[in-house]
Each structure stands twice: as structure tokens, then as C-alpha cells.
């Protein structure tokens, strides 16, 4: 980057090099050229030259002022007139940064993911920093008071075999850079409260011709959890509104769901499933779609024809005769 | 050799608008500063506006008597400067010039063109 | 912006006199000022640059020097074609300002 040039005096910044964005920041530049006498101090942003509010402080040093500087990162470099030379010689450069200081983390979020074999924790990390933010995930067991650490800076996996004391730990993450530190509030678990079922999955679909044709819907996990409730949505693709089934589900076998829907219409399908009285959610499963038949003839959709791609939308949800606005996350 | 031809001058009502231009031939046109300075008769020289080399992102400035009136442009592919004066006033009245700079020195100038604002 | 005083703001002189123009400057601008001679009716004509530095085409009776705050325009030996207004410029620091004037006439 700039910083590795070979310099012939310094450049610095004021407050500082990593700075709240919006700030006032003066830049400024020491030339120390043998034989010259700087005529003219120049400065440059990414390459361009700057024209503007530059005062000269004395022989060798001037400043480069700027008012609510909103970039997040500017590579600077100064350079100085010398007499009898013909060019501008390089003195200095210095990238500098603006962002901001860490939000307290908070939805502090720890779940194990059947057969993963890790505890991954996420958390909302408010807004944008701009600037290199790292995270420290405290992991402190409860019955041991041993607690341990991980550095991060998104999410982390935590092997599970590290969670050697016991079932119950405090969770809490620290976000800190250059501008400032927070720690969000500590969330307890229970290892056992917080394992999710391995993803059901929508392998096909059917319309069958009887005197009502019914649909049936083949799904199936590979969970070895014993209760395990899950929920179906379904709607025509052209609808706003997902109707929900509720299921308590035994994955011994293959699940076959019977729906009664309107001929020739394009409806999708997604599943999801909880350890039955437990806090977590898998997340919807890939959009699985089926085109019912006009009439008689019996209609199979298998799992490879589905459309995997994200529906993004916010829609409400029918649930045992209850109206509710269904924009849960993929885990709560 | 360096030639810069001012035009658009002329007699206008106060409030009124001008456009003045600067053909420019002999240098290369986008490598240099290209400045309006003008002069109000019996008076001295007055920097008007400015606009900057490629180097510096053809950056403009304007004199505070000036600012939001007057817009200075140009269109490195006919090599020419433009200044639009717009809600122009009896103080505007002066010669013109079309001057250019490399370093921050007015190196070149046009002939000029006079501007009178009067009613 | 940085402020120009020239003085005097005229003079008269001779021809083959040695006429000196000052040209004071609110701060110090590190030699970088530049001298304009200009004819009535006329474009503003650039002879010095960087405090002392001719331009070329300038006869050498012209002179510049100075630093800091203070310098000095000299022609050494006043000729008729010089009979005119010369201005100072400071471009040391942006914009660019002239002093107001000298205007040398005919005693």
C-alpha cells in the first residue's frame, strides 16, 4: 500500500489515523529533501490532486483541512516543488480510515446444528464500522466457572467437544476497534435446549385423482431426535398469504402430507422443524414447487425440478385459525 | 504556439444572462487550469472563477461576489472554456480574460471580452 | 486568501531610469509570485514567475527577487514600451490574488 514508499520526511494525520467518520481531520505533510527548499507543498487523495483549504504552516511543513470527511478509506500522499527541479518530488503517504465505534452486540443466538459437530453463535452487530472490527465470543461454563474465548470477526463455530464443562454456559460477545469497545448481555444456554433437527428436506410431490384430488407432499430429515414438531407452509405463487400446517413428526419413515388445493394452479412448498418445546426453528427449507393438474391425470414433481431460489418475501401466515405476520428469522 | 480567442461579450440588462466563451489551441488543453479574471474598467485584475486541471478532477472555484451566479465549464474535446453569468449586475461589468495556468500562475491570456451590464 | 499590497500604486520616471515596485504579502508565500506588465486596451503580459524566475521572450532589464513577505519588482534602465501597469500574484496558496496596482507613467 502507500505506507511502504520509501519517504523523504513524514506525513501524519490529526486526531488520528483511524477517525470517527464525519470528523473535521487535518493531514499534515514535513518535507525533509536534501537540497530543497519546498516551493509548494501538494497533497493528494487516491491520486487526485487536492486544491482546496491547504495553508502552509512553515518552510518545510503545510496542511491539507477537511470538513466532515465521510470516506471510509483515502489513500494519502504528499509532494513537494522543489526549485531547479522539474518534478514533483514524493515525500510521504498514509492510508487513513473513518467509520465508527461498535453497537452493543445484541440477539446474542447459539444453536448446534444436528451432526455439525459445532455450536455456532451469531449475533446482530448493529451498524456498519467501515473499519476492521473484531468480536471475542466469551464462553463461560456455569458449573466450572471456566471460560473461554474466541476471536472472531462475524460469526464462529465452536467445537462442541470444547465444551468440556458440562451443559450450561454464559454466552457473550465483545466488539471492539480502533474507536471504541462494547459487550453485549449475557445469554445462558443449556447444550441440550439448543440443538436444531437435521434439515427436512421436500423430496416430491403428487396429485392424486380421486373424487376431491388430493396433493401429497413426501418430505423427510435424517434427525435421530426423537420429537421433533415441524411447520409446512404452502401457497399459490401468485398469492401474498402462506397458509401453515402443524405437524408432530416421527422421521422413522418418510412423511406423506395430503393437501386439497385448486386445480391448475402453481403452489410452493417449505418445511421446518424444532425439537418438539424448544426455542429454535430450523430455517425454511429451499421453495418447493408443484403445478396441480387441470383435471384427471396424475401429476409428479420430484425434488431436483424444484427452483431453489429465495422468495424475499414478507408475508402473512394462517396457523391454526390465527392471522400472524410470518417474517421470522431463520432460527428464532 | 499558444493562442486562447474570448467571445460572447456584449451589452446586457441587469438580471439577464450571458454565456462567454474561450477557444483555446496550442497546449494541451486538459493538462492545464483554465481561469476567468476580469476587469472592471479603470480597476485592477480579479480572479472570477476557475477550473482545474485533469490532475486535480478539473476542480472549480468562484469568487464569493460570484458564487451561485456564475458557472464556469469546458469541454476538453472542442478545447474550449465557457462561463454562464447568470442574474448579471452593473458590478459584473468588465473586460473578461481567458487565462491559463499550469502551475498557479496565470501563464496566458486571451484578448478579453467586455461585458457591460446596464439598463 | 492571502492579501497583495503593491507599492506605490504609481510613479512617474524617466526613460533609462531604474524604476523599483514592492509587492508585500500578508504572509509568507515561499517566492511563489508572479509579475504582469499590462497596456491599455491589452491582455495582461506574464514577465517574472517563482519570485525571480524571466519569462521567456522578457527583455533581461527585468528583474524579480525577494522572499518571505516582501519583493521586488526592478527594471534597470526604464524603456518607453514600459510605460504601463504592472501587477503582482501570489500563488502560494489557492486562489490566487493580485496586489492593486502600480502604474508607471511618463515624467
Known amino acids: 500500500g502507500i505506507t511502504n514508499i520509501n519517504c523523504s520526511g513524514h506525513i501524519w494525520v490529526e486526531p488520528a489515523t483511524i477517525f470517527k467518520m464525519g470528523m473535521n481531520i487535518s493531514i499534515y505533510c514535513q518535507a525533509a529533501i536534501k537540497n530543497c527548499q519546498p516551493r509548494k507543498l501538494h497533497f493528494y487523495k487516491n491520486g487526485i490532486k487536492e486544491r482546496f483549504q491547504i495553508t502552509r504552516i512553515n518552510k518545510t511543513t503545510a496542511r491539507l483541512w477537511y470538513k466532515n470527511f465521510l470516506e471510509p478509506h483515502a489513500s494519502m500522499y504528499c509532494t513537494a516543488e522543489c526549485p531547479k527541479h522539474f518534478q514533483e518530488t514524493l515525500i510521504c503517504g498514509k492510508d487513513i480510515s473513518s467509520g465508527y465505534p461498535p453497537d452493543i452486540p445484541d440477539e446474542v443466538t447459539c444453536v448446534i446444528y444436528e451432526y455439525s459437530g459445532n455450536m455456532t453463535c451469531t449475533w446482530n452487530a448493529g451498524k456498519l464500522t467501515y473499519i476492521d472490527t473484531k468480536y471475542v465470543v466469551h464462553v463461560k461454563s456455569l458449573e466450572t466457572e471456566e471460560e473461554q474465548q474466541y476471536l472472531t470477526s462475524s460469526y464462529i463455530n465452536i467445537s462442541t467437544d470444547s465444551l468440556q464443562g458440562g451443559k450450561k454456559y454464559l454466552v457473550w460477545v465483545q466488539a471492539a476497534n480502533a474507536l471504541g469497545m462494547e459487550e453485549s448481555k449475557q445469554l445462558q444456554i443449556h447444550l441440550d435446549d439448543i440443538v436444531i433437527p437435521s434439515a427436512a428436506v421436500i423430496s416430491r410431490a403428487e396429485t392424486i385423482n380421486a373424487t376431491v384430488p388430493k396433493t401429497i407432499i413426501y418430505w423427510d430429515s435424517q434427525t435421530t431426535i426423537e420429537k421433533v414438531s415441524c411447520e409446512m407452509r404452502y401457497k399459490a405463487t401468485t398469492n401474498q398469504t402462506w397458509n401453515v400446517k402443524e405437524f408432530d413428526t416421527n422421521f422413522t419413515y418418510v412423511q406423506q402430507s395430503e393437501f386439497y388445493l385448486e386445480p391448475n394452479i402453481k403452489y410452493v412448498f417449505q418445511v421446518r422443524c424444532q425439537e418438539t418445546g424448544k426455542r429454535y426453528w430450523q430455517p425454511w427449507s429451499s421453495l418447493f414447487f408443484h403445478k396441480t393438474p387441470e383435471t384427471v391425470p396424475q401429476v409428479t414433481s420430484k425434488a431436483f425440478q424444484h427452483d431453489t431460489w429465495n422468495s424475499g418475501l414478507t408475508v402473512a401466515s394462517i396457523s391454526t385459525g390465527h392471522l400472524t405476520s410470518d417474517n421470522r428469522g431463520d432460527i428464532g | 504556439q499558444v493562442q486562447l480567442v474570448e467571445s460572447g461579450g456584449g451589452v446586457v440588462q441587469p438580471g439577464r444572462s450571458l454565456r462567454l466563451s474561450c477557444a483555446a489551441s496550442?497546449?494541451?488543453?486538459?493538462?492545464?487550469?483554465m481561469s476567468w479574471v476580469r476587469q472592471a474598467p479603470g480597476k485592477g485584475l480579479d480572479l472570477v472563477a476557475d477550473?482545474?486541471?485533469?490532475?486535480?478532477?478539473?476542480?472549480?472555484y468562484y469568487a464569493d461576489s460570484v458564487k451561485d451566479r456564475f458557472t464556469i465549464s469546458r469541454d476538453n474535446s472542442k478545447n474550449t472554456l465557457y462561463l454562464q453569468m447568470n442574474s448579471l449586475r452593473a458590478e459584473d461589468t468588465a473586460v473578461y480574460y481567458c487565462?491559463?495556468?499550469?502551475?498557479?500562475?496565470?501563464?496566458?491570456w486571451g484578448q478579453g471580452t467586455l461585458v457591460t451590464v446596464s439598463s | 486568501d492571502i492579501q497583495m499590497t503593491q507599492s506605490p500604486s504609481s510613479l512617474s520616471a524617466s526613460v533609462g531610469d531604474r524604476v523599483t515596485i514592492t509587492c508585500r504579502a500578508s504572509?509568507?508565500?515561499?517566492?511563489?509570485l508572479a509579475w504582469y506588465q499590462q497596456k491599455p486596451g491589452k491582455a495582461p503580459k506574464l514577465l517574472i514567475y517563482?519570485?525571480?524566475s524571466l519569462q521567456s521572450g522578457v527583455p533581461s532589464r527585468f528583474s524579480g527577487s525577494g522572499s518571505g513577505t516582501d519583493y521586488t519588482l526592478t527594471i534597470s534602465s526604464l524603456q518607453p514600451e514600459d510605460f504601463a501597469t504592472y501587477y503582482c500574484?501570489?500563488?502560494?496558496?489557492?486562489?490566487?490574488?493580485f496586489g492593486q496596482g502600480t502604474k508607471v507613467e511618463i515624467k
Open positions: 487565462a491559463v495556468h499550469h502551475s498557479d500562475y496565470f501563464e496566458y
Open positions: 496550442g497546449f494541451d488543453f486538459s493538462s492545464y487550469g
Open positions: 477550473i482545474n486541471s485533469k490532475s486535480y478532477n478539473y476542480a472549480t
Open positions: 504572509q509568507d508565500i515561499y517566492t511563489n
Open positions: 517563482h519570485a525571480s
Open positions: 500574484l501570489q500563488d502560494s496558496e489557492y486562489p490566487p490574488t
